[in-house]
Amino acid sequence: IWELKKDVYVVELDWYPDAPGEMVVLTCDTPEEDGITWTLDQSGEVLGSGKTLTIQVKEFGDAGQYTCHKGGEALSHSLLLLHKKEDGIWSTDVLKDQKEPKNKTFLRCEAKNYSGRFTCWWLTTISTDLTFSVKSSRGSSNPQGVTCGAVTLSAERVRGDNKEYEYSVECQEDSACPAAEERLPIEVMVDAIHKLKYENYTSSFFIRDIIKPDPPKNLQLKPLKNSRQVEVSWEYPDTWSTPHSYFSLTFCIQVQGKSKREKKDRIFTDKTSATVICRKNASFSVQAQDRYYSSSWSEWASVPCS
Amino acid sequence: RAVPGGSSPAWAQCQQLSQKLCTLAWSAHPLVGHMDLREEGDEETTNDVPHIQCGDGCDPQGLRDNSQFCLQRIRQGLIFYEKLLGSDIFTGEPSLLPDSPVGQLHASLLGLSQLLQPEGHHWETQQIPSPSPSQPWQRLLLRFKILRSLQAFVAVAARVFAHGAATLSP
């Protein structure tokens, strides 16, 4: 058993049929010695008396808010949550496995640049009695500060018969050094509490590995005189790190015909303009990636050829 | 060729070669996402490789003030990695094929470090640890960790040379 926060305790349980559970001793936070009784949640049933209460926690029915009273007045509360361990593995019932980039990916994180700011998100099908808290640091043995904002419900989607909820959080490294080579990874820890179930999820990454630039902006087409070719140009996204001579991007461009099956020729360039043949009804697209480190490509930015 | 005493390196040449290094480092180990390197023991096997840190003057402002600190750091790192890529970690089993990008990577690291070598001036370099793993699979793990680390190192170096070529070239 360990204290999650004041008056909230997590009981770690090996979860299998007929498991013995954990013996927990609760102490009433009061100078009083006599006449103390204990109840669980809203039930008025007295579970025991005395300054301490010893209980055997085996299942969710044994978890909840224990209150000690004297003369009808509540003296203190202890909320017990359960953290299940099945076959040596902590339960992951609350969040959905996003399976990208690999199995058992519950938290996904992205950064738009090297400023030390990043966003993490996760998915669940649970809609009520659910709370999250997030902590983050750089490194674990001698952690350096990362400040995270409030968790927000960022999207709701219908997946077949189920509704899926996406939660996200934004974090910022306190003393970011965009030009340096990261040596220690960022650690993100998410505590999830659903009713009386506690779970925790972690992710560890370097900012450089979660970089995904915003799409290039200001796509423009300029037809060339007496030619089927057009000059296309674009700009670095506003959110990308500066100066661009240092934090450079590379681009992938393609012209996509109306039919999705039509062959797309992709061209890679470090420049912010190119000359292409852009037929009527086709569209021109461009995406960006860090020029020197193979992190994610941005989403495509597109403009019709006509 | 480059940096005699305290003058500027051949920024454009260094830019080209460092960008080539980035490409080679990724072609040598593109499988990053499919492998759980942590599963094989969390102890940081590449902790003793040189990193370009905040105080090394490799940011745009630091380069404008005095690029020498940064260039020295980059050169130390290049020599360190060049030695690692020539060690038993990469020459032992499982063997790399003769046309493996690691061979070209090794040669390019040497080439860039020589571009940064001042005439008649030898910067001191870090002692190269040569941990020779007893198990071939540990050698493979070390290779992957070294290449991951090298990818990050050469990315910073390439940014430095790109910025230098754009803003500091005579």
Partner: antibody, heavy 126, light 111 residues
Framework: QVQLVQSGAEVKKPGSSVKVSCKAS????????ITWVRQAPGQGLEWMGE????????YYNEKFKGRVTITADKSTSTAYMELSSLRSEDTAVYYC???????????????????WGQGTLVTVSS | DIVMTQSPDSLAVSLGERATINCKAS???????????LHWYQQKPGQPPKLIYN??KLESGVPDRFSGSGSGTDFTLTISSLQAEDVAVYYC?????????FGGGTKVEIK
Amino acid sequence: QVQLVQSGAEVKKPGSSVKVSCKASGYTFTSYGITWVRQAPGQGLEWMGENYPRSGNTYYNEKFKGRVTITADKSTSTAYMELSSLRSEDTAVYYCARVEFISTVVAPYYYALDYWGQGTLVTVSS
Amino acid sequence: DIVMTQSPDSLAVSLGERATINCKASKKVTIFGSISALHWYQQKPGQPPKLIYNLAKLESGVPDRFSGSGSGTDFTLTISSLQAEDVAVYYCLQNKEVPYTFGGGTKVEIK
């Protein structure tokens, strides 16, 4: 074609040594390793060790506690396995096999004992 | 040392039927969670062994009725439709850790 030809059968006294040779042909000797595997009569296979002429690395099964020495002569494309302090339980067929142990992007840890010698029967008897 | 335990010791299967051989390692023989350092060899009487399945990949020239599966510590070699020429002893071999170790062998016969 690739061939590994081993030396002939040997009868040895307990306490003595035996040196089995394995002559390779049909491929570049230094591009592959040579592994030694033994098989006692009616028993399974036992890995003894392997040598890689290119890197000069040799790996041994510690079970043989320094009794086994595996070498290679690049000039004659021949590998050798010497076993000393022989005892009766060393009676076995000794095989050499070509080992390809490579790392590519597609197969980062490819290991194959792809060609084998015909085997050398070593009998240890007083 | 990693101990490789094969089961069963011997197996009699009718022609055209499926034969399944198991190999259990005393510790994980996968690397990076995805690469299995586990191989299968076939040995016919009076012959040296022959590699048939390597790192979850059938060797060229080996009939596709042979297939390998498993990861971590538990592996299986399956012959989907046993043929007369498949009668042999089959060995698993791990090469994650020196000393590399073979399983004790499974003898496959025709019922």
